[in-house]
Interface confidence: low
């Protein structure tokens, strides 16, 4: 049977003064020689050699300093052996407990804690939970941590409370105000031995960001505003109104939303927020009329883009700020009413009769008075054919020259031009459009086609016809002797009711020829003017095609009327057409 004794040892100090720390003995000692052996952690397992035994006496000594945080308990396995090395007793497990000393300070899980909390949060709202651990013996004073706020920055009234045991940081009151302080730094100390003066401690920082809520109403910088703008003008920035809002800049809690509460009956104004400056930009989006409203009294309100925080929302009232707009009278100058005026040329007016033909009068009114404009000059504006003139004072419009009623400028029987009225005082100009209805040329005027073609010098004949839309056949053709002598050069002979052959009576030189032909119908009605048939005489090949390049793109035909090439606008208008060879 074992007889044993074991004392506890204390970590971190020289325990040799307590040796022997333990003693073992077997009662078999009385009748034989016994050798005592020990094994285990601290003996033959790391840390080696902490304990030694006197094999004869069974006294166990401790030889080195121990650390409870590494080995809180040593289990020593003891054996009693006879001279043959046989166990006389069942092996004994001897326990040597290491007593704790306060050699470890608390350690926070983070050296810096970051947290955030909305301003105006209720008292006792949890902000953050701090956590420190202590390596000393659990459930012992040496590891019992007490937390304490050492300092608050910015200083002043304490805003947070710290639960001494749980490490929970909570709001002390509901008076957190981001607009006063947006950040707090707490230094928190954790002390073991339940905060006793002899305890060990460590510290951490706790950085608390105060989050913005929309608890500040925007207000306008001024109590009233005024501006002036000329009538009939738009403005992308008439006034800038500055909103002041203490909430966090750049957020929807700060961003102003401007409202036109009254006075914008004509939807003349719009107001938009400049997100950079938070200013309201009052714009004029519809022209104002001094005669209609010389003064406009707007009232402007402002709220935020975000909803107001529940803690203040019921107190919000939209305070209207007056904005006085003075509309400046502008000499508005003349205007044509109506803006387009129609005139017509009487039937039968033609040729020289058109010259100085009075179409009528077109005058402007004074927009300021509504009466006919007095101090204005009239001039012709756009006039494609340069056919018109106008009396600069009366606005009477006349033709200034004869013109061809088949002109390309007359579209669907209408000639369009512009009249300008210039105010002598302001120089302001009004534009009016006139549409002149030009009656069509005699319906019975048969057109000869084609008007341009080539003929071959060796067979100088060409077939001419009136267009298929003409009626009043049979038609007769004759060469108009103008200039005198031209009729002697050309012969024209009808071949049927609508066609004739035009033949040169003399040898032609290569070049352009222009022959005036008058066509009469069966009622002896003729076109107002002779029609010019333009011919290009050239040497031809066997296919009646010109050998030179001068007639490229112009119809070439023999008297059968077969055509050989296309006509183009540019080539059809060759400008050096003469009365004889070029």
């Amino acid at each position: 049977e074992w007889i044993k004794f074991a004392a506890a040892c204390r970590e971190g100090e020289d325990n040799s003064k307590r040796n022997p720390i333990a003693k073992i003995r077997s009662d078999c000692e009385s009748n034989q020689k016994i050798t005592y052996r020990i094994s285990g952690v601290g003996i033959d397992r790391p840390p080696y050699g902490v304990f030694t035994i006197n094999p004869r006496t069974g006294e166990i000594n401790i030889t080195s300093v121990v650390d409870r945080e590494i080995t809180p308990l040593f289990l020593i396995y003891c054996r009693a052996l006879n001279s043959r090395g046989e166990d006389l007793e069942r092996p004994l497990e001897l326990r040597v407990k290491v007593m704790d000393i306060n050699d470890n300070a608390p350690v926070f899980s983070q050296s810096v804690y970051t947290a955030s909390i909305e301003e105006n949060s209720d008292a006792n709202t949890l902000v953050v939970k701090l956590c420190a651990t202590d390596a000393d013996e659990e459930n012992h004073l040496n590891s019992k941590i007490a937390y304490k706020i050492v300092s608050q920055e910015p200083s002043g009234a304490p805003m947070f409370i710290l639960n001494r045991y749980t490490g929970e940081v909570c709001t002390m009151s509901s008076f957190l105000d981001r607009e006063q302080h947006s950040m707090y730094n707490l230094v928190v100390r954790g002390s073991d031995r339940d905060g006793a003066a002899d305890g060990l401690s460590s510290e951490c920082d706790c950085r608390i960001k105060v989050l913005d809520v929309n608890d500040n109403f925007p207000t306008l910088e001024k109590t009233s505003y005024s501006a002036s703008i000329e009538e009939n003008c738009l403005s992308s920035e008439l006034i800038r109104l500055q909103a002041i809002d203490l909430d966090e800049e750049g957020t929807d809690n700060w961003l102003a939303q401007y409202l036109i509460l009254s006075g914008n009956d004509g939807n003349w104004f719009d107001i938009q927020t400049d997100p950079q400056t938070n200013e309201g930009i009052l714009k004029v989006v519809k022209m104002l009329d001094y005669e209609q409203a010389p003064n406009i009294q707007l009232s402007i309100g402002v709220k935020n883009q975000a909803d107001f925080h529940y803690s203040v929302a019921s107190q919000f009232q939209m305070h209207p700020t007056p904005v006085r707009i003075q509309v400046v009278d502008v000499r508005e100058g003349p205007a044509f009413h109506p803006s387009t005026m129609a005139f017509s040329v009487r039937e039968g007016i033609k040729g020289s009769s058109l010259l100085n033909y009075v179409l009528g009068t077109y005058t402007a009114i004074d927009l300021d008075t509504g009466n006919p404009a007095t101090d204005v000059r009239y001039i012709i504006g756009h006039d494609a054919g340069s056919w018109l003139k106008i009396d600069s004072r009366t606005g009477e419009i006349q033709f200034s020259r004869e013109f061809d009623k088949k002109s390309k400028y007359i579209i669907n029987g209408i000639y369009t031009a512009e009249i300008l009225a210039i105010d002598d005082g302001s120089g302001k100009t009004a534009t009016g459009t006139i549409c002149i209805e030009v009656p069509d040329i005699n319906d019975y005027c048969p057109n000869i086609f084609p008007e341009r073609r080539t003929i071959c010098i060796d067979s100088p004949s060409v077939l001419i016809s009136v267009n298929e839309h003409s009626y009043g056949s049979p038609f007769t053709f004759c060469v108009v002797d103008e200039p005198p002598g031209i009729a002697d050069m050309w012969d024209v002979r009808s071949t049927n009711a609508t066609s004739a052959i035009l033949t040169a009576k003399q040898v032609l030189s290569p070049g352009f020829y222009e022959i005036p032909i008058l066509v009469k119908d069966s009622y002896n009605r003729a076109c107002e003017l002779a029609q010019m048939v333009q011919l290009y005489a050239c040497d031809c090949d066997d296919n009646h095609m010109c050998l030179d390049s001068g007639a490229a793109g112009i119809y070439t035909e023999d008297i059968t009327g077969d055509t050989y090439g296309p006509v183009t606008e540019d080539q059809a208008g060759v400008s050096n057409v003469g009365l004889g060879p070029a």
Epitope: Y258, D307, Y310, V312
Partner: antibody, heavy 128, light 107 residues
């Protein structure tokens, strides 16, 4: 009585645009916001954005940014929502809804936003 | 963007039953929550705003509760006209998101 009356059903081809109108009666259009919400067949409600009819200011859901335009004509008390570059998944019923702030009797310090009056809805079909 | 999650997505009940629908926000929204009722082919109708305030004209059998992230719509005694789809919606921030809806059907 207070009501919002919307324009009739529309059929559009992919890539086209549609404009839905919403006429307010029984109150002044400029007094309250107009929200637009859509609902695809058998699906839930999807908020598209709102417009302040007084200022014309708008806020659109990110999903519709660049494709939706909300406007108004206060003289005829009408709000409009135009959706462009239509695709088949835009087939839905589009609602306009009046948005306003509510005070709460039991909690005098509270101030909340909700949509209290809705239009009858406009069906928009996008199909090639 | 705030996510709103409703449960259950559908629910069968009988006339006279007490029914509860829940709505959860992905972050705290205080009491900025509305409930709407929608019947087939009709526009939604506002029932409750500010989590618990009953909209004018809505029967008192409807009630709302909750704050922060968890909210509840309760119908104390189901009536035939209450069979519809119910949606929650947050008004805390833009975009003003809706829950997926809860379809209440007759058992």
């Amino acid at each position: 009585q207070v009501q919002l009356v919307q324009s009739g059903a529309e059929v559009r081809k992919p890539g086209a645009s549609v404009r839905v109108s919403c006429k307010a009666s029984g109150y002044t259009l400029t007094t309250y916001d107009i929200n637009w919400v859509r609902q695809a067949t058998g699906q839930g409600l999807e908020w598209m954005g709102w417009m302040n009819p007084t200022s014309g200011n708008t806020a659109y859901a990110q999903k519709f940014q660049g494709r939706v335009t909300m406007t108004r004509n206060t003289s005829i008390s009408t709000a409009y929502m135009e959706l462009s570059s239509l695709r088949s998944e835009d087939t839905a019923v589009y609602y306009c809804a009046r948005g306003l702030f509510f005070g709460v009797v039991t909690k005098p310090n509270y101030y909340y936003y909700a949509m209290d009056v809705w239009g009858q809805g406009t069906t928009v079909t996008v199909s090639s | 963007e705030l996510q709103m999650t409703q449960s259950p997505s559908s629910l069968s009940a009988s006339v006279g039953d007490r029914v509860t629908i829940t709505c959860r926000a992905s972050q705290s929204i205080s009491s900025y929550l509305n409930w709407y009722q929608q019947k087939p082919g009709k526009a939604p109708k506002l029932l409750i705003y500010a989590a618990s305030s009953l909209q004018s004209g809505v029967p008192s059998r409807f009630s709302g509760s909750g704050s922060g992230t968890d909210f509840t719509l309760t119908i104390s005694s189901l009536q035939p006209e209450d069979f519809a789809t119910y949606y929650c919606q947050q008004s805390y921030s833009t975009p003003r998101t809706f829950g997926g809806g809860t379809k209440l059907e007759i058992k």
